[in-house]
């Protein structure tokens, strides 16, 4: 269940509502718990989580990765411009995060509830976002042909790519903890 | 040792219906995925349909040429493939080949054919 | 879909000699560190067969006669010594997404 929707938060009026920043930080810390359990299936299923990091770095894909000049890192830290990044890695990352929903057995509730608590987290973020004209959106045409081209993979790659997806998810989220933690 | 056996190719007017069958032996014929390939007389191979395991929903894939016209099945308990052919048309005319691929995408084990003709 | 281009069509090598079949793809078959290029050899009326998977690996029972190398769009199948035996078709195939493809076929024939 995402946070914020569980019962014991309705029953306990008591408790002080959850700040912007408290909120966003739990949704990011479910959806962490999330890719975890979706890891274990990948890496129990096939030896994907054993490969190379030379041969993981060695793709064709384009998934957001937090650099320098995004103002996320502790050294020109900027919050403005990291906040956008991070939203708009978000949103790069939702068409991959369609692809993974086929690619699970048992944990395929656990897929979806990655997916979905993340269009929350953009929700949240853009809330919090003053300059939202800096977001770009990816283009749903672009996104239907990189899915169908994702999905007619041989099945080697299909595994590998899901699994470099997961942790390139994980590291990005990570990055952005520690980054709207200072915020 | 690897076996697949095709039949339930034959001489076919245009318009008309067939259905291949491949009955697969000597592997776990439900972890992999299997193909249709063909070949006409005298041309290159050309790829016409794909399942994949269960694992991965069963999925189906289907060359445009022929997409709207075959459907690829398979049956794991009994370590069948089929492909039912409707409205044929002279230019499917061809031997019809059922392939095991591995998990790189390899086309690894072949079957002899079934020789499908189709002509008034 | 990738196009596999074959060259040359037809080839004519002396007993002894070298071979070498070309096949260029129109848009990289490499990811993850693999090449997913596949060579097939097909000998008159009969099913194709695999001699060599993902670029440069043999296929079971293929003799060392036969090798494949190159990476991303540009590979070739090399036979030698040819042999007598070796008269035959030769297909490339990628494996890296669906469709799959083929080349057009190489046909080698013996001098």
């Known amino acids: 269940v995402p946070p914020g929707e569980d019962s014991k938060d309705v029953a306990a009026p008591h408790r002080q509502p959850l700040t912007s920043s408290e909120r966003i930080d739990k949704q990011i810390r479910y959806i962490l718990d999330g890719i975890s359990a979706l890891r274990k299936e990948t890496c129990n299923k096939s030896n994907m989580c054993e490969s190379s990091k030379e041969a993981l770095a060695e793709n064709n894909l384009n998934l957001p990765k937090m650099a320098e000049k995004d103002g996320c890192f502790q050294s020109g830290f900027n919050e403005e411009t990291c906040l956008v990044k991070i939203i708009t890695g978000l949103l790069e990352f939702e068409v991959y995060l369609e692809y993974l929903q086929n690619r699970f057995e048992s944990s395929e509730e656990q897929a979806r509830a990655v997916q979905m608590s993340t269009k929350v987290l953009i929700q949240f973020l853009q809330k919090k976002a003053k300059n939202l004209d800096a977001i770009t959106t990816p283009d749903p045409t672009t996104n239907a042909s990189l899915l169908t081209k994702l999905q007619a993979q041989n099945q080697w790659l299909q595994d590998m790519t899901t699994h470099l997806i997961l942790r390139s998810f994980k590291e990005f989220l990570q990055s952005s903890l520690r980054a709207l933690r200072q915020m | 040792e690897v076996q697949l056996v095709e039949s339930g190719g034959g001489l076919v007017q245009p318009k008309g219906t067939l259905r291949l069958s491949c009955a697969a032996s000597?592997?776990?014929?439900?972890?992999?995925?299997m193909n249709w390939v063909r070949q006409a007389p005298g041309k290159s191979l050309e790829w016409v349909a794909r399942?994949?395991?269960?694992?991965?929903?069963?999925?189906?894939y289907y060359a445009d040429s022929v997409s709207d016209r075959v459907t690829i099945s398979r049956e794991d308990s009994q370590s069948m493939l089929y492909l039912q052919m409707t409205n044929l048309k002279t230019e499917d005319t061809a031997m019809y080949y059922c392939v095991r691929e591995d998990y790189y995408g390899t086309l690894d084990y072949w079957g002899q054919g079934t020789s499908v003709t189709v002509s008034s | 879909e990738i196009v596999l281009t074959q060259s040359p069509p037809s080839l004519a090598v002396s007993l002894g000699q070298r071979a070498t079949i070309s096949c260029r793809a129109s848009e990289s078959v490499h990811n993850f560190g693999i090449s997913f290029m596949n060579w097939f050899q097909q000998k008159s009326g009969q099913p194709p067969k695999l001699l060599i998977y993902t670029a440069s690996n043999q296929g079971s029972g293929v003799p060392a006669r036969f090798s494949g190398r190159g990476s991303g769009t540009d590979f070739s199948l090399i036979i030698h010594p040819v042999e007598e035996d070796d008269t035959a078709m030769y297909f490339c195939?990628?494996?890296?997404?669906?469709?799959?493809?083929f080349g057009g076929g190489t046909k080698l024939e013996i001098k």
């Open positions: 399942t994949v395991t269960k694992s991965n929903k069963y999925a189906t």
């Open positions: 195939h990628q494996g890296k997404e669906v469709p799959w493809t």
């Open positions: 000597g592997f776990s014929f439900n972890t992999y995925a």
